[in-house]
Structures are given as structure tokens and as C-alpha cells.
Interface confidence: medium
């Protein structure tokens, strides 16, 4: 069937449209196009004879039409009047006619719209605003956007006039936004520039900052006022009802008690004509004197002297406070406060009592702190430590020993070798040592203030050949599943590798085994009874290797759940009952028996001769290991038949 398709159907003014013919019959003589829904010679646009390929314009021809051999018609530079129906009249070679009608619609290209408003400065909670989208255009759809979003649902928003007008009732400050309108028709869509709604509001009740209402004499008073308002508010300050100044901030330097009173901030909006005020009451307190600490002993000796710290000046009806190390006073029998808290006494000072100490005087407003005071506690010297801790050195290296003893004032040091004084220094250095440098190295530390002296002696062996090592342990009887054991291979020697063996084998891989301290220390975590083995440590350097004697770990365990033997539970009357109880335990457990809950003897074996049915019942064996502190038990039922 012959059909006409309009491409496009909706055509913009000035563009073109193609009336495309489908299912054109064969053996044609020619065809004609007419404006309208029927064949009307007065409204012929163009005719076409196929044989001559000749096109003939008709009365309705505008000069903008082009006919194609396939009968399609192109109309260019479309105008509004072109809207409507078009009919194709086909004449076949057998002179039988056929007709088909098509149509299209013409729309204008829309101009960019703009928004007009009936109120450029609406007042919050009072005015309404009507936005209108211009120009008014036929066959156009109107849309609105707020902050580039489609209109929210609100009873205060209303569309009218075919959506061309948007009315906001009772505007609020939140309506301050970007508004746009959009016009659409089938051939175009255009969006307006945004219009910002300027809602007048406020002032709200002003806020005065800072919130602080208490000041001390001599401080600066700096108050700032702010009220939400559009346009921004104008501010005025009143003190005790008297106008001061028209500024947002009020500044009064070096205030006195006389500046106490009520401070009012007034905010005024000239556009809305509204005023709002806020009042704050300021209290100015007199400045108390800054406290300070006096001490009855500036250089106390540790474990000998007491020190009394007093907070000055003495002021009646005042609360005194103390701090040590920026913390409130700890509870300690060595710290005593006087009745009025003004004096803090430290009994038998220690080196940890250095402080700093602060005292404070409390007034209505705040606490005034003294400057911190630090005690110079004389102490020491403690037993000196000689480092490094190596006792074995290989020949040819440098021996560098350092001595340190905790002491105040710092200790003076002396070194002796085999009892002979060497030098009065903290460090002893001997280069390129030989076996002859083996001996007893003594460090002496002296505190000139306390007059005390302490010494430490270290045996140094110079030899490339390593000694036979030994194993020290931090726990000789660890408890299974509870304790850890640390084995240390002695001595500590320079440039030495430490190795370990368990039962003659190298260490197994286990998360419970950990080597540390340069492999010198072997730690067994959460020991088990299976760890009760022979442990050997080895040391090696470039020229020698040596192994310790084995150390067997004595793991305390158990008691495990006991076993009663024999397993029989049925006996004949007159038989002997001989029950033996055993529980795995180290050390061996203590055994006790209960028959039907009644305690019997404390033995591993329970013997009853010539039993009768009276001996029926429950037989319980209890085991306890005093070393592990653990207990266990088992119950067995015995039946004696007559």
C-alpha cells in the first residue's frame, strides 16, 4: 500500500522536511503533489512525468520544493504556513490512479526565556513573590528549576498561568536560591539565566561572644555581637542602659571592678525596620597576688632529709592547692599537709621526689598558680654498672669500658685493674689487648656531696679460645601451661655466635620457642611436660667452639585425671578389694580416698579384706599436687554380690 512518511514529523521553522514515499507501484506514468488532504488542481505543488523526467510546478509551488524520481518531496526553509497535509497522486501506465496523504507540523525555534518578578526584595514571613517566565509562546510547555533541581513539593509554592507563573507565598530566608525557567516545544528547549531571590530577614536575637561572664581585674574585655540578618544588621552597645557605641565589637582595655554590669547589644535591620537585643551580665573580680613556694632545705639528701614546702603569701580564708608533676597530690605516707594546706612536707625524700611542685590560691574566679619549684635531691652513687657486659675478649681488639652510677651530683669515677689504680675517668680504654690484660677491673664511683662511694668488679678474660659455657635459668621449676622459662647462655662474649640443642638435636621450629639477645637467650613460653628435656648451649667464634653441660628442665605438671585399677566394678562377697590409684604428676601427687563421700585413708592403694554387700557404693580417688596447686579426682562404682 502506498504510504507517506514525514521526516521529521515536527519541523522547526527555517529547517527542511522530506516527504518520503513507501511502496511506490511499478509501471508508472507520473505523479503529482498537492497541498491538503485531496487532489485539487488549484493546490497542486508540482507534477512529474517519468518518461520525459520533466517536473512541472503547480499553483501552490513556492520555489522551496524539490521532487525526486522516487516521488519523494523535499520542502526547504519551512515556514509556519507549511503545517498540514500533503497528498501524492500517482498515475500508473494503465492510467489507474492511486493516492496517499502525509502530514507534518511546524513549530517556531523558541527564544531564550527570562524571568520577571513582582517583588525584588520580599520580607521574610510577610511577602509573596510571583516569578513569570517571558515571553508567552503558543504551544510551549513551561518548567521551573530551583538551585538546578526540579521544584520541591511545598504548599507555599504554586504554579499558574499554564505553569508560566511560579508564586512563593510567605517567603523565608531559605527561599534565597537560584531560580530558572525553561520553555519547551517539540523542536526546541531553552533555559533562562538564573534569578537569585533576595529575601530580607532578621535581625534574629543577637549572640554575644565569648560566653564567659567572669573576668579578673586588669584583663581586656572584648565582646563581639552577631545577629543573622539581611541586609547585615547595624549594632549598638549599651552598658547599664547607657549607649556606648555603634559597632559590632565592644573593647574595654584593663578593666576594673567598676566595669561590672549589664552589657546590651542591639541589632537593627534598616530594610525590615526590626530591632532585637541581647543582655549579658559581666562580673569583674579583684586580682589576687601570685603565690610562690619557699623551701626549708634546697639540697636534701635521699633517705635522710625531710623537706617542708610552704605556699606564700599567707591569706586568711583562702584555699591552698598543691600539684606534683602537674598532677594533684598522690596518696602517700611520706606526704603530709598542714591543717590549712599551706605547707607540704616530704618525709625522707627520694630521688623521685624532684617534682616539679606548684601551689595555688583559689578565688571565686580561678586558681592562681605559683611558678614550679624543683627539688635538688642529693643521692647515690648507686652500684656502678660497667658496660659493655662482655667478659670475654679476643686478643688484638680494643678494650673500651664505660662506668655509670646513678648519682646527684654526678659521680666521680676511678678505675683499678687487679687492685691497682689506673685513672680517674668514666671510661677506660686499652688498645690492642693481649692475654696479659686479663684480670679484675674495678670501677669506683664517688659522690662528693654525700661522701658515699660504691664499687663494681668485673672479670675480663682475654683469649681467642672460648671457655666452656653454662646455662642459667630464670625459673627452675616452671608449671605446665602457665609459666615461661628463659635459658641464658653464659658468659656473654664479644664476636661470638650462640647455638642451642634440645636432646642433642637442633632447636625444633615452634611458636613457643623464641631466641633473643643475639641467640644468647632461649625462651620457652607456656611450658609443657614434653619440654622436660636436656638443653645444651654452644658458643663459637672464628677459632673455637664449646658446649655447655646439659640442663634438664623440671616441668611441674598435673595431676592428670587419675586411673583406678583394676577396672573391675563387680565383686563376689568375701573377696578382697584392692584398688590402686595413679595420676601423671610432677612431683608425685598426694592420694586420698572417699567411700560414699566419707574420707578414708591418704594412700595410693585402698585395701579392704573380705568385702560384703555392705561395701557397695562409690569409691573416689582424690589427687593433689602441692607444687602446681592443682587437684583432680575420679569416681568408681563398686557392686558386691552375695
Amino acid at each position: 500500500k502506498l504510504t507517506i512518511e514525514s521526516t521529521p514529523f515536527n519541523v522547526a521553522e527555517g529547517k527542511e522536511v522530506l516527504l518520503l514515499v513507501h511502496n511506490l507501484p511499478q509501471h508508472l506514468f507520473g505523479y503529482s503533489w498537492y497541498k491538503g488532504e485531496r487532489v485539487d488542481g488549484n493546490r497542486q505543488i508540482i507534477g512529474y512525468v517519468i518518461g520525459t523526467q520533466q517536473a512541472t510546478p503547480g499553483p501552490a509551488y513556492s520555489g522551496r520544493e524539490i521532487i525526486y524520481p522516487n516521488a519523494s518531496l523535499l520542502i526547504q526553509n519551512i515556514i509556519q504556513n507549511d503545517t498540514g497535509f500533503y497528498t501524492l497522486h500517482v498515475i500508473k501506465s494503465d492510467l489507474v490512479n492511486e493516492e496517499a496523504t502525509g502530514q507534518f507540523r511546524v513549530y517556531p525555534e523558541l527564544p531564550k526565556p527570562s524571568i520577571s518578578s513582582n517583588n525584588s526584595k520580599p520580607v521574610e514571613d510577610k511577602d509573596a513573590v510571583a516569578f513569570t517566565c517571558e515571553p508567552e509562546t503558543q504551544d510551549a510547555t513551561y518548567l521551573w528549576w530551583v538551585n538546578n533541581q526540579s521544584l520541591p513539593v511545598s504548599p507555599r509554592l504554586q504554579l499558574s498561568n499554564g505553569n508560566r507563573t511560579l508564586t512563593l507565598f510567605n517567603v523565608t530566608r531559605n527561599d534565597t536560591a537560584s531560580y530558572k525557567c525553561e520553555t519547551q516545544n517539540p523542536v526546541s528547549a531553552r533555559r533562562s539565566d538564573s534569578v537569585i531571590l533576595n529575601v530580607l530577614y532578621g535581625p534574629d536575637a543577637p549572640t554575644i561572644s565569648p560566653l564567659n561572664t567572669s573576668y579578673r581585674s586588669g584583663e581586656n574585655l572584648n565582646l563581639s555581637c552577631h545577629a543573622a540578618s539581611n541586609p547585615p544588621a547595624q549594632y549598638s552597645w549599651f552598658v547599664n542602659g547607657t549607649f556606648q557605641q555603634s559597632t559590632q565589637e565592644l573593647f574595654i582595655p584593663n578593666i576594673t571592678v567598676n566595669n561590672s554590669g549589664s552589657y546590651t547589644c542591639q541589632a537593627h535591620n534598616s530594610d525590615t525596620g526590626l530591632n532585637r537585643t541581647t543582655v549579658t551580665t559581666i562580673t569583674v573580680y579583684a586580682e589576687p597576688p601570685k603565690p610562690f613556694i619557699t623551701s626549708n632545705n634546697s639540697n636534701p639528701v635521699e633517705d635522710e632529709d625531710a623537706v617542708a614546702l610552704t605556699c606564700e603569701p599567707e591569706i586568711q580564708n583562702t584555699t591552698y592547692l598543691w600539684w606534683v608533676n602537674n598532677q594533684s597530690l598522690p596518696v602517700s605516707p611520706r606526704l603530709q599537709l598542714s591543717n590549712d594546706n599551706r605547707t607540704l612536707t616530704l618525709l625522707s625524700v627520694t630521688r623521685n621526689d624532684v617534682g616539679p611542685y606548684e601551689c595555688g590560691i583559689q578565688n571565686e574566679l580561678s586558681v592562681d598558680h605559683s611558678d614550679p619549684v624543683i627539688l635538688n635531691v642529693l643521692y647515690g652513687p648507686d652500684d656502678p654498672t660497667i658496660s659493655p657486659s662482655y667478659t670475654y675478649y679476643r686478643p688484638g681488639v680494643n678494650l673500651s669500658l664505660s662506668c655509670h652510677a646513678a648519682s646527684n651530683p654526678p659521680a666521680q669515677y676511678s678505675w683499678l685493674i687487679d687492685g691497682n689504680i689506673q685513672q680517674h675517668t668514666q671510661e677506660l680504654f686499652i688498645s690492642n689487648i693481649t692475654e696479659k690484660n686479663s684480670g679484675l677491673y674495678t670501677c669506683q664511683a664517688n659522690n662528693s656531696a654525700s661522701g658515699h662511694s660504691r664499687t663494681t668488679v668485673k672479670t675480663i678474660t682475654v683469649s681467642a679460645e672460648l671457655p666452656k659455657p653454662s646455662i642459667s635459668s630464670n625459673n627452675s621449676k616452671p608449671v605446665e601451661d602457665k609459666d615461661a622459662v628463659a635459658f641464658t647462655c653464659e658468659p656473654e662474649a664479644q664476636n661470638t655466635t650462640y647455638l642451642w640443642w634440645v636432646n642433642g638435636q637442633s632447636l625444633p621450629v615452634s611458636p613457643r620457642l623464641q631466641l633473643s639477645n643475639g641467640n644468647r637467650t632461649l625462651t620457652l613460653f607456656n611450658v609443657t611436660r614434653n619440654d622436660a628435656r636436656a638443653y645444651v648451649c654452644g658458643i663459637q667464634n672464628s677459632v673455637s667452639a664449646n658446649r655447655s653441660d646439659p640442663v634438664t628442665l623440671d616441668v611441674l605438671y598435673g595431676p592428670d585425671t587419675p586411673i583406678i585399677s583394676p577396672p573391675d566394678s563387680s565383686y563376689l562377697s568375701g573377696a578382697n578389694l584392692n584398688l590402686s590409684c595413679h595420676s601423671a604428676s610432677n612431683p608425685s601427687p598426694q592420694y586420698s580416698w572417699r567411700i560414699n563421700g566419707i574420707p578414708q585413708q591418704h594412700t595410693q592403694v585402698l585395701f579392704i579384706a573380705k568385702i560384703t554387700p555392705n561395701n557397695n557404693g562409690t569409691y573416689a580417688c582424690f589427687v593433689s599436687n602441692l607444687a602446681t596447686g592443682r587437684n583432680n579426682s575420679i569416681v568408681k562404682s563398686i557392686t558386691v554380690s552375695a
Epitope: R394, P395, G396, T434, E435, S463, A464, E465, P467, G538, Q540, S542, V543, S544, A545, N546
Partner: antibody, heavy 120, light 106 residues
Framework: QVQLQQSGAELVKSGGSVKLSCTAS????????MHWVRQGPEQGLEWIGW????????EYAPKFQGKATFTTDTSSNTAYLQLSSLTSEDTAVYYC?????????????WGQGTTVTVSS | ENVLTQSPAIVSASPGEKVTITCSAS?????MHWFQQKPGTSPKLVIY???NLASGVPARFSGSGSGTSYSLTISRMEAEDAATYYC?????????FGAGTKLELK
Amino acid sequence: QVQLQQSGAELVKSGGSVKLSCTASGFNIKDSYMHWVRQGPEQGLEWIGWIDPENGDTEYAPKFQGKATFTTDTSSNTAYLQLSSLTSEDTAVYYCNEGTPHGPYYFDYWGQGTTVTVSS
Amino acid sequence: ENVLTQSPAIVSASPGEKVTITCSASSSVSAMHWFQQKPGTSPKLVIYSTSNLASGVPARFSGSGSGTSYSLTISRMEAEDAATYYCQQRDSYPLTFGAGTKLELK
């Protein structure tokens, strides 16, 4: 099993230098110290020194300071002894000797020796 | 350096005979080590740290001593024991060997 394979015999002119090698198998030389010992014709054993292949630390007998230089190549598990300013006195068999108790004892493992002959 | 003096320089022994070789140090040492060397072969450790038998060494070998005086003893000489024996100290650098004692089979 632990083995030390030394390079072949060397004939060197007086004043010249030579580099001997010792390749280990059965262990990683980084876990050991490598000692070098020499033995002159019809003479006793003389300790030259050692090298720690892990960090390159060395110890030389005073007599061989400046004469012997130890190096290692851990990628090929090989230790080297370089001898310089050779004289007829340096004619000897040179042994490498592994100084860590794989055995479990020290000095259990020796190379087969490299004969160095210094000719004038 | 610590000089080690071995004696005798040469010793002959019949199979089954007891042999003792001594080693004297110019400075005291904590331990002495002994090596055996047969012609054309590398030295082999026989005793370490004065008295410990090295791996694979027959029990007829033993060692003793302290300070500056040490000895190696073969309780019953066997033909395979014929070799040169060297003592070694490892207490001080340089490590030193004795001049050697040649043990021959009678």
C-alpha cells in the same frame, strides 16, 4: 656432605702474584669463617689468617700482612687467597680450611691444597 | 706470638706400643688441639680442646694438659697411626702450630 675444592697448581715468577680459589659445597660459606694455612716443603703448618664471608671481616697473621689478601664471592660459594710480591720463600702448599663446627668440631674440613711454586 | 715446642721431633714405635707426644707453649693457653697429617694429604683434626676426640678418631687416641704443658697419647700404636702430628693453640693471634712430631712404625 661438606667439601672444599681448591684450584690447581701454580708456577709463578719471582715478584709476581697469584690468586688461589677454594669452592665450598654442602654448606653456605656465609655461615662460616674461612681460614688459610700454608706448608712449605718438608716444613710445618703456618696459619695465614681468616675471613668472615658474611661481612668481609679479616684477621691476618702479622707475617702475612700485605702479602696475603682474602676475598670471597658468596654467589659462587668461593673464597680466594691472593698472594703478591712472591719470593722463593712463598713456595708451599696452601690449604683452605672451614672454621665453623659443621662437624660438630672446628677445622674438620680442609681443601686438598694448592701447590704454588715460585721460580726465579 | 705464642711459640709451641713439640718433642720429640721424631719417634719410632712398634705396633701395640704406647706413644706420648708433648707440646710446650711459651705463654699459658686454655686448650690445645692436635692434627694428624700423612704424606700428600691435608691435615686431619684428632683431638680438640685438649682432651676431646674428633669425629671418627679411634679411642686409642687421648689428650691431656693445662697451662703451658700438653700431651697427645696413643695407647697402642697401629700401622695406620704413622704420620706427622701437630699441636695448635687458638687462644691468641696469630694462631700457631708446633713444628710437628713425626711418628714412624718400627
